[in-house]
């Protein structure tokens, strides 16, 4: 069953007398999702040798996964709070179709996959409340997402395993970059 935020030894809950601030709640939520990703990766690595594959081989897979770049304003060099927040929200919205793809990819960790997906939706809502420049946030077209999902699900077993591994690793790195940036806001 999914671990709830605050249950993990690394995730010390704040004292009851002090409700979490919006930033603390977002921070805690990201850490919870990262814990979930890690649990999912354990199952992926146990059932295939994808975890031993080099990044270069995996990068050949033409997935257009969201990635932080210098221009996004999330790195300290050229840091821009508004631009960065838009990138984080846009990136998370783009990851949603890939998280949907993961839903039928796990056997023993099915609940954990669902928890990661649902927690990401909640995280997006938290961040949208924080964002001032909501006009700049582009939501992926449902039809585009639907055809991408169909295409991913039509891959052979090996490609599906590789896609699963690459999505989880990329999502982890995106969240790590997001967390570093959000702690500066």
């Amino acid at each position: 069953a999914p671990v709830l935020p605050g249950e993990d030894s690394k995730d010390v809950a704040a004292p009851h007398s002090q409700p979490l601030t919006s930033s603390e709640r977002i921070d805690k939520h990201i850490r919870y999702i990262l814990d979930g990703i890690s649990a999912l990766r354990k199952e992926t690595c146990n059932r295939s040798n994808m975890c031993e594959s080099s990044k270069e081989a995996l990068a050949e897979n033409n997935l257009n996964l969201p990635k932080m770049a210098e221009k996004d304003g999330c790195f300290q060099s050229g840091f821009n709070e508004d631009t960065c927040l838009v990138k984080i929200i846009t990136g998370l919205l783009e990851f949603e179709v890939y998280l949907e793809y993961l839903q039928n990819r796990f056997e023993s960790s099915e609940e954990q996959a669902r928890a990661v997906q649902m927690s990401t939706k909640v995280l997006i809502q938290f961040l949208q409340k924080k964002a001032k420049n909501l006009d700049a946030i582009t939501t992926p077209e449902p039809t585009t997402n639907a055809s991408l999902l169909t295409k991913l699900q039509a891959q052979n077993q090996w490609l599906q395993d590789m896609t699963t591994h690459l999505i989880l690793r990329s999502f982890k790195e995106f969240l790590q970059s997001s967390l570093r940036a959000l702690r500066q806001m």
Epitope: K10, S38, R41, C45, F79, K172, L179, R180, R183
Partner: antibody
Framework: EVQLQESGPGLVKPSQTLSLTCTVS??????????WSWIRQPPGKGLEWMGV???????YYKPSLKSRTSISRDTSKNQFSLQLSSVTPEDTAVYYC???????????????????WGKGTLVTVSS | QAGLTQPPSVSGSPGKTVTISCAGT?????????VSWYQQLPGMAPKLLIY???KRASGIADRFSGSKSGNTASLTISGLQSEDEADYYC??????????FGGGTHLTVLG
């Protein structure tokens, strides 16, 4: 108490591949949130971070060494390894393995604080 | 890309205070609280003193303290003792899951 011990050949010929293993005792390398690093120190010079393998098995390398470096792990043996290809005499150094992962390192991907180190092993590259 | 910049050497008398600087950029030291300090005695492996800019590692005396201002981090050693004579290195996280060390500073305890 966590202990780390480097092992491997002390002499490697130029153009060959340097292979080192770090055996960890007193704790599992599969322990949540820790990462395992390689650092080297040429004789009389400073420390150079080479790369890290994190809790999930993801590897990150120093950009200038990336094309020649590979870090892997064997959780069943509680070991992690370094391979450095196409070595030259400039790769002569004391090679250290170390554990990283204090604080929120895992969540942030920032493995710059290494709290346990091996004693180091000198590798000489010479024909 | 170059490492972090430290003075090659500093010195101080027993009982006094010395500070070692570590200059970086907005891509490393200037980012968050990602700075650590190590002590390396002759012929020994480095030992972690400080992490997250100012948190002392387990078992480290409170004579050792860390701070940061802008893109420069500092290690301060008060009540200098002869056994503090060693090389000191700073390290920082650098963008995109990379770590960079300073060139090292040799501390000489006079007298």
């Amino acid at each position: 108490e966590v202990q780390l011990q480097e092992s491997g050949p002390g002499l490697v010929k130029p153009s060959q591949t340097l292979s080192l293993t770090c055996t960890v005792s007193g704790g599992s390398i599969a322990t949540s949130y820790y990462a395992w690093s390689w650092i080297r120190q040429p004789p009389g010079k400073g420390l150079e971070w080479m790369g890290v393998i994190d809790y999930d098995g993801d590897t990150y390398y120093k950009p200038s060494l990336k094309s020649r470096t590979s870090i892997s792990r064997d959780t069943s043996k509680n070991q992690f390894s370094l391979q450095l290809s196409s070595v030259t005499p400039e790769d002569t150094a004391v090679y250290y393995c170390a554990r990283a992962g204090l604080g929120d390192s895992y969540y942030l991907g920032t493995y710059y604080a290494m709290d346990y180190w091996g004693k180091g092993t000198l590798v000489t590259v010479s024909s | 890309q170059a490492g972090l910049t430290q003075p090659p050497s500093v010195s101080g008398s027993p009982g006094k205070t010395v500070t070692i600087s570590c200059a970086g950029t907005t891509s490393d030291v200037g980012t968050g609280n990602f700075v650590s300090w190590y002590q390396q005695l002759p012929g020994m492996a480095p030992k972690l003193l400080i992490y997250d800019v100012n948190k002392r590692a387990s078992g480290i005396a409170d004579r050792f303290s860390g701070s940061k201002s802008g893109n420069t981090a500092s290690l301060t050693i008060s009540g200098l003792q002869s056994e503090d004579e060693a090389d000191y290195y700073c390290a920082s996280y650098r963008s995109l899951n990379n770590v960079v060390f300073g060139g090292g500073t040799h501390l000489t305890v006079l007298g």
